[in-house]
Interface confidence: low
């Protein structure tokens, strides 16, 4: 079997405050059984953005179906826009673990510029 | 292996339909858009639109809207494309190609090509 | 959509020798391009995605370059199987056009 890609085929995303981004990702293979989360940076800092798995993110909603067995689409859109959404997102993969699930592999990041919005 | 294999050649009239199969085998056919190619005789590659066999989710070339149509059968991992109202222009080899990543960054695996012929 | 021209239309090499193909795109496609190559009855083979990175199993000979509008594919030394003909294709807007091929040829 193929090993698993994770794949951000945007490298950067330009949007207008106040708009919604949608950031691009999907895997290559079912395998390894795991959930996948968005993270903005990267390193001991990052900031979580999206757990397929638990959490309650409001201003992200799914572009497909996460729950469909045979999903590998896993981009996502963020609403309303900010100056402070700015950055660069990861789309990474987790392989199923006890008791902690464990980080199997990330997207190369997809970079999220604001414009100011139109007057 | 991962391999693609097609049906075999077609002879149609003019204003009829084909259906072209492509059974893939040797990795997830969920996990790879594939694509539709066609080579008139002596001529260059034409990219004729792609199929998700994850969602169904299809995109055509404009050329071709109306005309084609991409579906596939996940329980047996194949694909398949049909073209209507045929003419003889669309005489030409037509392959199936699997994309290198789940998004396009090239065509990795091709089938062997289906020859259509529409004479009348 | 977007133009691919290749140039030259027929490239005639001695084997050894050194080819350089060019596939240039009608607007930018940054580096979303991929070179493929077909010989006479055969499918087409991917050779180069993302404008330089070699396909799985593809002789280092092979090589991309370039990036937005201008594009290269090089074969360092042409060996006898490498006579054939060669597209560039741009994946980076829909439709994903093809160029219009350039056919290596013995000289």
């Known amino acids: 079997e193929d090993e698993l890609q994770v794949i951000q085929p945007e490298k950067s995303v330009s949007v207008a405050a106040g708009e919604s981004a949608t950031l691009r990702c999907a895997m290559t293979s079912l395998i390894p059984v795991g959930p996948i989360m968005w993270f903005r940076g990267a390193g001991a800092g990052r900031e979580l953005i999206y757990n397929q798995k638990e959490g309650h993110f409001p201003r992200v909603t799914t572009v497909s179906e996460l729950t469909k067995r045979n999903n590998l689409d896993f981009s996502i859109s963020i609403s309303n826009i900010t100056p402070a959404d700015a950055g660069t997102y990861y789309c990474v993969k987790f392989r199923k673990g006890s008791p902690d699930d464990v980080e199997f592999k990330s997207g190369a990041g997809t970079e999220l510029s604001v414009r100011a919005k139109p007057s | 292996q991962v391999q693609l294999v097609q049906s075999g050649a077609e002879v149609k009239k003019p204003g009829a339909s084909v259906k072209v199969s492509c059974k893939a085998s040797?990795?997830?056919?969920?996990?790879?858009?594939m694509h539709w190619v066609r080579q008139a005789p002596g001529q260059g590659l034409e990219w004729m639109g792609w199929?998700?066999?994850?969602?169904?989710?299809?995109s055509y070339a404009q050329k071709f809207q109306g005309r084609v149509t991409m579906t596939r059968d996940t329980s047996i991992s194949t694909a398949y494309m049909e073209l209507s109202r045929l003419r003889s222009d669309d005489t030409a080899v037509y392959y199936c190609?699997?994309?290198?990543?789940?998004?396009?960054?090239?065509?990795?695996?091709w089938g062997q090509g289906t020859t259509v012929t529409v004479s009348s | 959509e977007i133009v691919m021209t290749q140039s030259p239309a027929t490239l005639s090499v001695s084997p050894g020798e050194r080819a350089t193909l060019s596939c240039r795109a009608s607007?930018?496609?940054?580096?979303?391009l991929a070179w493929y190559q077909q010989k006479p009855g055969q499918a087409p083979r991917l050779l180069i995605y993302?404008?330089?990175t070699r396909a799985t199993g593809i002789p280092a000979r092979f090589s991309g370059s370039g990036s937005g509008t201008e594009f290269t594919l090089t074969i360092s030394s042409l060996q006898s199987e490498d006579f054939a003909v060669y597209y560039c294709?741009?994946?980076?807007?829909?439709?994903?056009?093809f160029g219009g091929g350039t056919k290596v040829e013995i000289k």
């Open positions: 607007q930018s496609v940054s580096s979303n």
């Open positions: 199929i998700n066999p994850n969602s169904g989710g299809t």
């Open positions: 993302s404008a330089s």
């Open positions: 294709q741009q994946l980076d807007n829909l439709p994903y056009t």
């Open positions: 190609a699997r994309d290198t990543y789940a998004y396009s960054y090239g065509m990795d695996v």
């Open positions: 040797g990795y997830t056919f969920t996990g790879y858009y």
